[in-house]
Interface confidence: low
């Protein structure tokens, strides 16, 4: 806690300017009026202070406002922003994009900290869904950010939001997240035609369900193997030989590069072994010629 | 042992066909994509065209659409590529190759010569 | 222009390891394997390295395929007398619909 001590005879600062960063921290405590700083915040950042007279000035804004920073300060924190708790940040009310950016460009190039998560919460918490501005803007800081959301979370992302999301944006969402993701694109991009709409379905097809893929199928996309590779299993198992070789394309000789992994080991399991050599590929473990094939979910939903 | 030998090039004049055959041996044809990849003198490897096992898809070089057409007789284990409206940047040595994504087998080439 | 670009030349003398590059784009060599080929003088291709990095039987293990992100390469140790050929990379393009070759690179035992 800085002591309180009279300010010393003419160091009373008429403006927050470069010459505060002589003073020492108890000099900065007594001189520096927290009205003059919270409506000249703007100017701090292009001062140096040192990390010490920074946690000076945030003790004078936090005397100033205990229930929390008004708006007008917020947007201008600068590096000030570093300095502030998740339980600080729990008290605003950020209502601004401008606010929001401006914030996390003081935070750009590192991990989302603690504090940053607080802040998105509390801002789009505020704003009842997650649109496509804010959706825009934090996948632009963070291109993880969507798949940081629970499935629940994600559940209020509209659909019109769709359209901000890049393939990046999804690389490290898990299957859970794409179910509840999939069938927002498919509503977001339905007006497009063929090949526009599945380079920008591509991505969120870890979520497709078979009918679906099927229908792809049907309209020489050609699918790359990575996409396949991250297709649900359970979706890709009912495909038959033709179907696998449709959606592919091209790109059907890859699979047996990826003949150990799922989903493919499993879908060729599922596959009758005549029908898996007509692909010329050398795929094995497929059902012996001659064998009877019972689907047993079938038997299951019929008893 | 895997044999792949292409026929039915020659000289044509500017505007003129041609039917290229590619007899393959030594595997199970009906199985695998095939495709047609050329060289011009003293240039690289240009792909042409590739055809499905089943001949249900082809694809195409921008260079040749509508020009060229691709096709097999799976019953006589031969791949034709017939070519016309040929013009002098056509003029190279064609090559029959196994496979759409990695040309694992190739024929020997056979040289088209396209000049009036 | 070759949709892959290749150095048109390399160079080793007998014994030493060369590499050879090859760059695209994330709609070929970033979301396909990329396969390499090599044409000895008067001949026609031979496949070399395929998905990227295997080696089909029969081709020594002085020859290896790498790839990351949108480059792949090719390396030869020991290099000999009889490498001396032009070495081709090749992948599906997505955004074309098309294969593609690099332009080809003539490698030279000094």
């Known amino acids: 806690e800085v002591e309180k001590t009279a300010c010393p005879s003419g160091k009373k600062a008429r403006e927050i300017d470069e010459s505060l960063i002589f003073y020492k921290k108890w000099e900065l405590e007594a001189c520096v009026d927290a009205a003059l700083l919270a409506t000249q915040m703007d100017r701090v950042n292009a001062i140096p202070f040192t990390y010490e007279q920074l946690d000076v000035l945030k003790h004078k804004l936090d005397e100033l406002y205990p229930q929390g920073y008004p708006e007008s300060v917020i947007q201008h924190l600068g590096y000030l922003f570093l300095k502030m708790s998740p339980e600080d940040i729990r008290k605003w009310n950020v209502t601004s994009l401008e606010t929001l950016k401006a914030l996390l460009e003081v935070n750009k190039g590192h991990e989302m900290s603690p504090q940053v998560a607080t802040l998105i919460d509390r801002f789009v918490k505020g704003r009842g869904q997650l649109d496509k501005d804010t959706l825009d803007t934090l996948t632009a800081f963070y291109p993880g950010y969507l798949c940081s959301l629970s499935p629940e979370e994600l559940s209020s992302v509209p659909p019109s939001s769709i359209w901000a999301v890049r393939p990046q944006d999804l690389d490290t969402c898990d299957p859970r997240q794409l179910d509840v993701l999939y069938p927002k694109a498919r509503l977001a991009f339905q007006n497009m035609n063929g090949s526009e709409y599945f380079v920008k379905i591509q991505s969120f097809l870890g979520g497709a369900p078979t009918e679906d893929l099927k229908a792809l199928s049907q309209q020489n996309v050609s699918m790359d193997l990575a996409t396949f590779m991250k297709l649900r299993t359970d979706a890709v198992l009912p495909l038959t030989v033709a179907e696998v070789q449709k959606l592919l394309g091209p790109h059907v000789e890859g699979l047996k590069a990826e003949e150990r992994h799922r989903p493919v080991r499993d879908w060729i399991l599922r596959q009758r072994q005549d029908d898996l050599d007509t692909l010329g590929l050398g795929l094995q473990g497929g059902i012996p010629n001659g064998y009877l094939v019972l689907d047993l979910s079938m038997q299951e939903a019929l008893s | 042992e895997v044999q792949l030998l292409e026929s039915g090039g020659g000289l044509v004049q500017p505007g003129g066909s041609l039917r290229l055959s590619c007899a393959a041996s030594?595997?199970?044809?009906?199985?695998?994509?095939m495709s047609w990849v050329r060289q011009a003198p003293g240039k690289g490897l240009e792909w042409v065209s590739s055809?499905?096992?089943?001949?249900?898809?082809?694809y195409y070089a921008d260079s040749v659409k509508g020009r060229f057409t691709i096709s097999r007789d799976n019953s006589k284990n031969t791949l034709y590529l017939q070519m016309n409206s040929l013009r002098a940047e056509d003029m190279a040595v064609y090559y029959c190759?196994?496979?759409?994504?990695?040309?694992?087998?190739w024929g020997q080439g056979t040289l088209v010569t396209v000049s009036s | 222009q070759s949709v892959l670009t290749q150095p048109p030349s390399a160079s080793g003398p007998p014994g030493q390891r060369v590499t050879i590059s090859c760059t695209g784009s994330?709609?070929?060599?970033?979301?396909?394997?990329v396969s390499w080929y090599q044409q000895l003088p008067g001949t026609a291709p031979k496949l070399l390295i395929y998905?990227?990095?295997h080696r089909p039987s029969g081709v020594p293990d002085r020859f290896s395929g790498s790839k990351s992100g949108t480059s792949a390469s090719l390396a030869i140790g020991g290099l000999r007398s009889e490498d001396e050929a032009d070495y081709y990379c090749?992948?599906?393009?997505?955004?074309?619909?098309?294969?593609?070759f690099g332009g080809g690179t003539k490698l030279t035992v000094l």
């Open positions: 030594g595997f199970t044809f009906s199985n695998y994509a």
């Open positions: 994330s709609s070929n060599i970033g979301n396909n394997s």
């Open positions: 190759a196994k496979n759409l994504l990695t040309f694992d087998y």
């Open positions: 090749g992948a599906w393009d997505d955004s074309l619909n098309a294969y593609v």
């Open positions: 055809i499905y096992p089943n001949g249900s898809s082809k």
């Open positions: 998905y990227d990095s």
